[in-house]
Amino acid sequence: QEEDLPRPSISAEPGTVIPLGSHVTFVCRGPVGVQTFRLERESRSTYNDTEDVSQASPSESEARFRIDSVSEGNAGPYRCIYYKPPKWSEQSDYLELLVKETSGGPDSPDTEPGSSAGPTQRPSDNSHNEHAPASQGLKAEHLYHHHHHH
């Protein structure tokens, strides 16, 4: 009999509110034995797969997906799914990535320009958190976000 697969979790390092031009890493977690983790945008047709799976604990595996230089277009909901043969799991909760426009970011005029990439496999951490405090202490001029329907 096939086992029931637990839902994966999703988080982001360093968090869910990211300065424009800085990096973020999505962390997907599931049980041991996962072959492939997938990071999906709101539309299931936009995704990244990785088989670069590491052991997070004796009972958990994880994969990391890094965006090297966040832009307004990266704002919005993300979720994880995994393949543990012979089947795919349910999706995780959505994590909403917000992008803040600030002065003093890594690509400000007084610093060297940086490299830029779309979700490329590489890591980081934070999770779907509807109760997280709202950006206290942030000196943000704008927050970019993306409205979606569950």
Partner: antibody, heavy 118, light 109 residues
Amino acid sequence: QSLQESRGRLVTPGTPLTLTCTASGFSLSSYHMGWVRQAPGKGLEWIGYIHTNRNTWYANWAKGRFTISKTSSTTVNLRMTSPTTEDTATYFCARGSYGDYNFLFDVWGPGTLVTVSS
Amino acid sequence: ELVMTQTPASVSEPVGGTVTINCQASEDISIYLAWYQQKPGQPPKLLIYDASTLESGVPSRFSGSGSRTQFTLTISDLECADAATYYCQQYSTTDTNNLFGGGTEVEIK
């Protein structure tokens, strides 16, 4: 808004020990919580943190040696599975989530001294 | 894994002087760097985050700069109350042995 660690104690090597951090003025369900330690006369050493989704992350050296858990909306625990004399230190709990960053710590407990000695 | 290297280990300057503390990350951490002040018998206190953003209530004598791998904390117009140990902390990734640099002890002459 404040944090308070349980009172430190003297334990013998190999004896498991659990420290408790109690929050006042805010709910731990809304914040990620970390643990940091400081050996006498030494620098700050990150142990790990627990996310609001109850996932945990640990420093590479701390994996398997410590377990962090949330036990209620006001308490988070640090369990030392098998302490050695090198674990003698002041242990701090700290609140993350500042500016929505998971492990940027803005509120700290005063710390509690744990002495591991035979 | 990411390593934070802080220099110097200690520094001594007179009242009214300026202290500069450096922190180097072994890989790009963008602006995900904080500075803390710790006095004996007390927990650390957050001074600066996002490399250069001053925490509320922190005097403007404290300033931070840098990005990617090189960061600096500058304390100007030194006061006796600034005698403490200062730590940098990256909050870019948990793939590390320690989020913190080794610390810099500041003595005021």
